[in-house]
């Protein structure tokens, strides 16, 4: 029943062009190129995409034409390597072009930059955007794909097509509205926030595949799909996992045409077989392709079947446990994970994976014994502390969030994480701690049964951002250790870190705490980031500062900004009051 077993095609590029259609083909090639060559100007990419598209059309007309039999990696890699400024713009990435496939593609993948040195995207005035949209809709939408793809080199390409479709719909509707801004801006904000979340979620999938291997990704997928489709048989879930793994392996590997094509096939298969998968798919399956795939990926968990038997019978009490384990270890562990996950939509995926790992470790030890059952009889008791740890952590942090509100909760996390890993760059600490803090408003509103899957799986996504950013410029052994030892134990590893006693406090630099009148014109969010940046720097200067000391300094700082932003001569106020504030803060913190 494999969805993806196709006849061999004489021309892969023709095959994908025909399957996807010209519009999607061009969009996906543009995304692929922008994700590889993140610094290239838009016009250069459009030119390359047009050349590839024209070539693909010749292959559609005659699959035996010259070069049409070449692999997509060969065709795309050859095209990328024609860029004249490759050496000047990308430095050693140009060396990739001296390699043969598949090494050349691997080389390009290794040079993808999670934090490219690109200017922040500034949103023009609504009228300016609407004019650009009306003047050349195609270019406007291509520009969107290009700008997102180059800043998010692991963005899930078929999902980016869905975002672009919504982006287009927003402009089509709102540029005709009476109040264009009121219509458009909330939609753009929503797309931006959803886009960042989507990018981060996909980045974790790619990290899982690339750093921990296919087995790790498949385990994650078994757990998640079993929670989502608890009525589906194990064989059905296994088939979906195999196909989903292929889709994500392709996208994470830069094979975006194959990925999009296979994702469409998977959506088709799921909808054709929804009776044996989930009762919640009906609405999704009535939608057009891009919406359908997105909807399936986000679909709510189906109801659990009634009267599921106890897990202990097959996995603890049965005399055949070790026999079944020996016969097919991964299948047996997969069945354990499936059975546990479908019964526990209230657990995070990472918790389910920790339980499965504990079960595996126990079987490895106990099945070597003369009396295995005596050894593993109490294995489920070992699960209790593993379940209670995230439950308690979430309870404590939700209480703190409810007490402080999002901004102050983020500040508490900023202090906590700066003390744990003070070597990490300030922008990274601010970005990651702000995102960690968003778990409060995202998850604490949920009832108990939904809190853990929401919170802990979200934290896994955010901590992966820390891991990929840190990997680019490693500065902390503790971060490296937590990021590389175990994918499912990253969060507990970071939670367990105490204050880094080996850290030598940063030298005090008054310039870091010098502010100007421009802070008054910033949005509330930007102003918060400025203040949080100062907070991280304070902790780096004085890691032993108490909560009370830091709170006092931050309150003074907030009052100082408010006062100077109301002053007639703002700049003079910032200069004079700023000096006083720095002096007072130094005294308060004993700097």
């Amino acid at each position: 029943r494999g969805v993806f077993r196709r006849d061999a095609h004489k021309s892969e590029v023709a095959h994908r062009f025909k399957d996807l259609g010209e519009e999607n083909f061009k969009a996906l090639v543009l995304i692929a190129f922008a994700q590889y060559l993140q610094q290239c100007p838009f016009e250069d990419h459009v030119k390359l995409v047009n050349e590839v598209t024209e070539f693909a059309k010749t292959c559609v007309a005659d699959e035996s034409a010259e070069n049409c039999d070449k692999s997509l990696h060969t065709l795309f890699g050859d095209k990328l390597c024609t860029v004249a400024t490759l050496r000047e713009t990308y430095g050693e990435m140009a060396d990739c072009c001296a390699k043969q496939e598949p090494e050349r593609n691997e080389c390009f993948l290794q040079h993808k930059d999670d934090n490219p040195n690109l200017p922040r995207l500034v949103r023009p005035e609504v009228d300016v955007m609407c004019t650009a949209f009306h003047d050349n809709e195609e270019t406007f939408l291509k520009k969107y794909l290009y700008e997102i793809a180059r800043r998010h080199p692991y963005f899930y390409a078929p999902e980016l097509l869905f975002f672009a479709k919504r982006y287009k719909a927003a402009f089509t509707e709102c540029c005709q509205a009476a109040d264009k801004a009121a219509c458009l801006l909330p939609k753009l904000d929503e797309l931006r926030d959803e886009g960042k979340a989507s990018s981060a979620k996909q980045r974790l999938k790619c990290a899982s595949l690339q750093k921990f291997g296919e087995r790790a990704f498949k385990a994650w997928a078994v757990a998640r799909l079993s929670q989502r489709f608890p009525k589906a048989e194990f064989a059905e879930v296994s088939k979906l996992v195999t196909d989903l793994t292929k889709v994500h392996t392709e996208c994470c590997h830069g094979d975006l045409l194959e990925c999009a094509d296979d994702r469409a096939d998977l959506a088709k298969y799921i909808c054709e077989n929804q009776d044996s998968i989930s009762s919640k798919l009906k609405e999704c399956c009535e939608k057009p392709l891009l919406e359908k795939s997105h909807c399936i990926a986000e679909v709510e968990n189906d109801e659990m079947p009634a009267d599921l038997p106890s897990l202990a019978a097959d996995f603890v009490e049965s005399k055949d446990v070790c026999k079944n384990y020996a016969e097919a270890k991964d299948v047996f562990l997969g069945m354990f994970l499936y059975e546990y996950a479908r019964r526990h939509p209230d657990y995070s995926v990472v918790l389910l994976l920790r339980l499965a790992k504990t079960y595996e470790t126990t079987l490895e030890k106990c099945c070597a014994a003369a009396d295995p059952h005596e050894c593993y009889a109490k294995v489920f008791d070992e699960f209790k502390p593993l379940v209670e740890e995230p439950q308690n952590l979430i309870k404590q942090n939700c209480e703190l969030f409810e007490q402080l509100g999002e901004y102050k909760f983020q500040n508490a996390l900023l202090v906590r994480y700066t003390k744990k890993v003070p070597q990490v760059s300030t922008p990274t600490l601010v970005e990651v701690s702000r995102n960690l803090g968003k778990v409060g408003s995202k998850c604490c509103k949920h009832p108990e049964a939904k809190r853990m899957p929401c919170a802990e799986d979200y934290l896994s996504v955010v901590l992966n951002q820390l891991c990929v950013l840190h990997e680019k410029t490693p500065v902390s052994d503790r971060v490296t250790k937590c990021c590389t030892e175990s994918l499912v134990n990253r969060r507990p590893c970071f939670s367990a870190l105490e204050v880094d006693e080996t850290y030598v406090p940063k030298e005090f630099n008054a310039e870091t705490f010098t502010f100007h009148a421009d802070i008054c014109t910033l949005s509330e969010k930007e102003r918060q980031i400025k203040k949080q940046t100062a907070l991280v720097e304070l902790v780096k200067h004085k890691p032993k500062a108490t909560k009370e000391q830091l709170k006092a300094v931050m309150d003074d700082f907030a009052a100082f900004v408010e006062k100077c932003c109301k002053a007639d001569d703002k700049e003079t106020c910032f200069a004079e009051e700023g000096k006083k504030l720095v002096a007072a803060s130094q005294a308060a913190l004993g700097l």
């Epitope: 026999k323 016969e327 014994a369 295995p372």
Partner: nanobody
């Protein structure tokens, strides 16, 4: 594909001896405890003896304690059962299993104790 192939059974007089072997393949033999199980005609399976993966810990049912000795050679992926002082009530099909399973995954080898 897990395969367990027993051999060494036969007809023996009461008080006699036999050595059964079980050749294993298709799994990491040296990582698993193993058992011998027997099934007499018309009866359910009966666990006889077990050994841990390293061969250091052996267990026996009361009915064979002091007469049977289980052992293994991990290099050869083979399990053994040395049966001494055999009695008519030891007559059964003997098969080896992984862990303490009593599920029959092989043909087994027939042991008949009769004068």
């Amino acid at each position: 594909q897990v395969q367990l192939v027993e051999s060494g059974g036969g007809l023996v007089q009461p008080g006699g001896s036999l050595r059964l072997s079980c050749a294993a393949s298709g799994f990491t033999f040296g990582s698993f405890g193993m058992s011998w199980v027997r099934q007499a005609p018309g009866k359910g399976p009966e666990w006889v003896s077990a050994i841990d993966s390293g061969g250091g810990d052996t267990r026996y049912s009361d009915s064979v304690k002091g007469r049977f000795a289980i052992s293994r050679d991990n290099a050869k992926k083979t399990l053994y059962l040395q049966m001494n002082s055999l009695k008519p009530e030891d007559t059964a099909a003997y098969y080896c299993t992984i862990g303490r399973s009593t599920s029959r995954g092989s043909q087994g080898t027939q042991v008949t104790v009769s004068s």
